[in-house]
Amino acid sequence: AGVFELQIHSFGPGPGPGAPRSPCSARLPCRLFFRVCLKPGLSEEAAESPCALGAALSARGPVYTEQPGAPAPDLPLPDGLLQVPFRDAWPGTFSFIIETWREELGDQIGGPAWSLLARVAGRRRLAAGGPWARDIQRAGAWELRFSYRARCEPPAVGTACTRLCRPRSAPSRCGPGLRPCAPLEDECEAPLVCRAGCSPEHGFCEQPGECRCLEGWTGPLCTVPVSTSSCLSPRGPSSATTGCLVPGPGPCDGNPCANGGSCSETPRSFECTCPRGFYGLRCEVSGVTCADGPCFNGGLCVGGADPDSAYICHCPPGFQGSNCEKRVDRCSLQPCRNGGLCLDLGHALRCRCRAGFAGPRCEHDLDDCAGRACANGGTCVEGGGAHRCSCALGFGGRDCRERADPCAARPCAHGGRCYAHFSGLVCACAPGYMGARCEFPVHPDGASALPAAPPGLRPGDPQRYL
């Protein structure tokens, strides 16, 4: 167990041209607050996926009123740290989202209004117990400067907060096989209570005899890296031999959602849909009022004046969830054309186009014939984002640069012999056959079946195919 701590140093205009307008004015004074969302591993940074490591809201900053004509300065910030407690091991790699929110304090009907000013996201590696890490992130014309760290809560220590420390029983040294707990040199590492052989790097335990794995590791001793590439089922528990996830109980079995929340499986875990008044990964957080700003993404909070009365978030179009924290899946309408892959980035839809297509919705079939010449009189033919050449007689290959052997396909029927000719091919027919391809038998009475031989040309003469 431990705490992730975030210290916001400044939020204001970034360098370069196009300084943003101040978010507050004399007519609409406002104050800022921040929300941080943490997810384990290098997971997707989509704002609507659950903050599985935890989330926190800052206090409100001081009220700010823009001075007329002055450029937007760094805005006054809330006091204190944002703290996100984590119950399990610190994962070492994590994704974060930091949102800057504006609370307008004008005389709006129904109380203050909230709007999202900026959202930054990133993926980082961080060992618990290390020094503060500094970061600068830009969102549009805004710049956010902050520091963060993860620290373990006693008795936990270590880079993942999985080792336990206890006060020394003897003043001089620790017991046999137990090391001092740096940096708490007056404490000793607690006796190992995990299952024997449990990986010290990738496993941890909270109960004697168990071995729980950090993300990306599996097996009874957490020694097998997870590899789902050759696996069929998306569910655990894990196979100790292959590292494959094999069928087992679903993540919603036993309903991990508290306070009447309903559980739905996601590709990697589960998701709780919480009743009003509750939020958190397992709907475990309650006592929230509208003053806490529980509605995200511009949702309007109504009711909930005190912790005993539930609030309601009225979500703007495109958002849902009891706290407007989830985005509606707009990609399910399949807006991308020509097999493009749809990505919902939150502020916009993006299409990743297949080769040969372009445009915001992959609507443009790239003209592959543009600037592509087919040699020797060939013509370029479009098709499916690729091009091919339809070659003139006697030529072949991708660009009609290769001289084709017209006799390669054995065009002369009934044993006729083929001769290449500058304008095509000539068939010398076997006795009893005639025609450009020796396709017509000559009747015994001398009359051909079809067509009649041209004047001056006897059956059996070579016939040139024009």
């Epitope: 707009r330 309408l333 807006p335 991308c336 493009g340 915001p360 919705r361």
Partner: nanobody
Framework: EVQLVESGGGEVQPGGSLRLSCAAS????????MGWYRQAPGKQREMVAG???????IYAESVKGRFTISRDNAKNTVYLQMSSLRAEDTAVYYC??????????????WGQGTLVTVKP
């Protein structure tokens, strides 16, 4: 600005039918994709039926054979004919459209929703 206006919702008995309409208006150069979503109380919003960017029709598994989507391109309007309605079809039905504006940008828009209630 683009507006999507839904109509046709109401209360109906199980087995009954309703026809929803959604008309798009505003600075629209073209409509790329358009269709219907629904959201039942306490549930996630889900796609019901639509015309994709490629012009194909798609349906949620739960409504196939019962709902039919159609459109009038001249009026920038889509319709959802709902037959053999069931209690589980009760929801707010939202029109959605991916639109190319006169600026040539694409934007995704939502209607305000129309309530469909199926009860005996």
């Amino acid at each position: 600005e683009v507006q999507l206006v839904e109509s046709g919702g109401g209360e109906v008995q199980p087995g009954g039918s309703l026809r929803l309409s959604c008309a798009a208006s505003g600075s629209i150069l073209s409509i790329n994709a358009m269709g219907w979503y629904r959201q039942a109380p306490g549930k996630q919003r889900e796609m019901v039926a639509g015309f994709t960017g490629d012009g194909n029709t798609i349906y949620a598994e739960s409504v196939k054979g019962r709902f039919t989507i159609s459109r009038d391109n001249a009026k920038n309007t889509v319709y959802l004919q709902m037959s053999s309605l069931r209690a589980e079809d009760t929801a707010v039905y939202y029109c959605a459209a991916d639109v190319q504006l006169f600026s040539r940008d694409y934007e995704f828009y939502w209607g305000q929703g129309t309530l469909v209630t199926v009860k005996p």
